[in-house]
């Protein structure tokens, strides 16, 4: 990464530094310390103060975006003296050269794309690059196959997961022969970017009463279990007027998917099709395919 | 309709060990995870452990560690919980329970419980 | 001692509404943890009412709702009646446990 790091210090230094690849921001430990601790400030003036390593000489920041810049402060107070110092992490380079708008998504379960915009003062030969770190930080993942737009790099698709946490770190860095290049960088939860498929294995049953619809949750990457989704039926009479209401019924899931409603024979043609959402974000997938109950001269 | 059912009460002496099983039917096993939540008058409820899909194996509260194991025989949609070096204050009713969603646990179905006596 | 504080026992008559709190910490409930909420009828095992905060499985009446705020949660029952009686329980999880909790149990009597 091409971001400068400026040290602001009086003259007996703690040396402070800040590795980015692990946000581990360590310096000299200082002998009889007594009190240390260490935080940043970001460009909103929000503070963030992680808690200190064993040896309370580094510190270890879990959940922080760096591109806006952000200024590292470290106090150590020893028997003899305290000590201050600040550390500027810029984002460097042009204004304005950082990929934007950058999103990710998850779907089919087990596949992710990226996508994101060159900068609108990025010259020609920019080449943008993409690394994913996990929230446990053991691994970095580069994208192994990018989609360009005339030879530049606008995303990444990619097709093993097995990586990513529930949380994870996206950087896009940027090169180029003629200017310095930003970087943009985001913290991206996998249940709020995973596109579900709609339920599966979706049948109707009828009696001489009732119809049952039956269905099974979609394979999703994130770990979740029945009573994590919530279901939409979207029960639809055959050849009615146009504008005439479809009935939307909310199911919450359940070991076994099913809806139970009155519908006596002789019956119209109908037709059923379901759509499934995380409950908490109500993120709809596609609608499945509509199966058809009923007969035309019902 | 998926039920849990449990293995009948058991009366122990004090240093022994208990087995309470937990069948499974109307579902697969293979396709949940089970837990084992045990219920005191003094203490109210405590989480025993359970299979953790994130970890992808069983884990188990730190208090009860050492002295339990939870196994599961997919075979015959069985779960299993032993705990040994029993003493009195594990008199209580065992629950098995499937989880409904992972992010906390929640317990969607429960077993009868198995009611344990540890008495000399 | 349970981890979450429940009061031990809540009233109301046919009809009314009643709430029960439970109060947790920075490790559990506001680390942010969701709630969850379960009946016990006496002698038999628990039956999940709430989840996710506030959510109702299929066939829990909308008599029940909850919320949560901060390092506390609370459960709501409108319409009281008669077999509302019994024990109500909150259960979240906790981050420096690593693993699930639960309140003491409050004991629901109508009168």
């Known amino acids: 990464e091409k971001s400068d790091l400026r040290t602001v210090a009086p003259a007996s230094s703690l040396n402070v530094r800040f590795d980015s690849r692990t946000m581990n921001l360590s310096w000299d430990c200082q002998e009889n310390t007594t009190f240390s601790k260490c935080f940043l400030t970001d460009k909103k003036n929000r503070v963030v103060e992680p808690r200190l390593s064993n040896n309370e000489c580094s510190c270890t920041f879990r959940e922080i975006c760096l591109h806006e810049g952000v200024t590292f402060e470290v106090h150590v107070n020893t028997s003899q003296r305290g000590f201050q110092q600040k550390l500027l992490y810029p984002n460097s380079g042009r204004e304005g050269t950082a990929a934007q708008n950058f999103s990710c998504f998850i779907y089919n379960a087990d596949l992710m794309n990226c996508t994101w915009a060159r900068g609108p003062t990025a010259p020609r030969d920019v080449q943008y690059f993409l690394y994913i770190r996990n929230s446990k930080r053991r691994r970095e993942i580069r994208c192994p196959y990018y989609i360009q737009d005339s030879g530049t790099h606008v995303g990444c698709h990619l097709d093993n997961l097995s990586g990513l946490t529930s949380r994870n770190y996206f950087l896009v860095n940027g090169t180029s022969r003629e200017i310095g290049i930003q970087f943009f960088d985001s913290l991206l939860d996998t249940k709020k970017i995973e596109r579900f498929n709609p339920p599966s294995n979706v049948t109707v049953r009828c009696n001489t009463t009732h119809c049952l619809v039956r269905w099974k949750q979609p394979r999703t990457y994130q770990k979740l279990s029945y009573l994590d989704f919530q279901y939409q039926l979207d029960v639809h009479r055959k050849n009615t007027q146009p504008g005439t209401e479809n009935l939307l019924i909310n199911v919450s899931g359940d070991l076994e998917n099913r809806y139970n409603f009155p519908s006596s024979e002789p019956r119209a043609k109908h037709s059923v099709k379901i759509r499934a959402a995380d409950v908490r974000i109500l993120n709809w997938s596609s609608w499945s395919e509509a199966i058809e109950f009923g007969s035309d001269d019902g | 309709q998926v039920q849990l059912v449990q293995s009948g009460a058991e009366v122990k002496k004090p240093g022994a060990s208990v087995k309470v099983s937990c069948k499974i039917s109307?579902?697969?096993?293979?396709?949940?995870?089970i837990h084992w939540v045990r219920q005191t008058p003094t203490k109210g409820f405590e989480w025993m452990g359970g299979?953790?899909?994130?970890?992808?194996?069983?884990v188990y509260a730190q208090r009860f560690q050492g002295r339990v194991t939870m196994t599961e025989d997919t075979s015959i949609d069985t779960a299993y919980l032993t705990l040994s070096s029993l003493r009195s204050d594990d008199t209580a009713v065992y629950y098995c329970?499937?989880?409904?969603?992972?992010?906390?646990?929640?317990?969607?179905?429960w077993g009868k419980g198995t009611m344990v006596t540890v008495s000399s | 001692q349970a981890v979450l504080t429940q009061p031990s026992s809540v009233s109301g008559a046919p009809g009314q509404r009643v709430t029960i709190s439970c109060t947790g910490s920075?490790?559990?409930?506001?680390?942010?943890?969701?709630v969850s909420w379960y009946q016990q009828l006496p002698g038999t095992a628990p039956k999940l009412l709430i989840y996710?905060?506030?959510k109702r499985p299929s066939g829990v009446p909308d008599r029940f709702s909850a919320s949560k705020s901060g390092t506390s949660a609370s459960l709501a029952i409108t319409g009281l009646q008669a077999d509302d009686e019994a024990d109500y329980y909150c259960?979240?999880?906790?981050?420096?446990?690593?693993?699930?909790?639960f309140g003491g149990g409050t004991k629901v009597t109508v009168l």
């Open positions: 329970a499937i989880v409904g969603s992972f992010s906390p646990p929640t317990y969607g179905y």
């Open positions: 109307g579902h697969s096993l293979s396709e949940l995870s």
């Open positions: 299979f953790d899909p994130e970890e992808n194996e069983i």
């Open positions: 920075g490790s559990n409930i506001g680390a942010p943890y969701d």
């Open positions: 996710h905060n506030n």
């Open positions: 259960q979240s999880y906790d981050s420096s446990l690593s693993g699930s909790v």
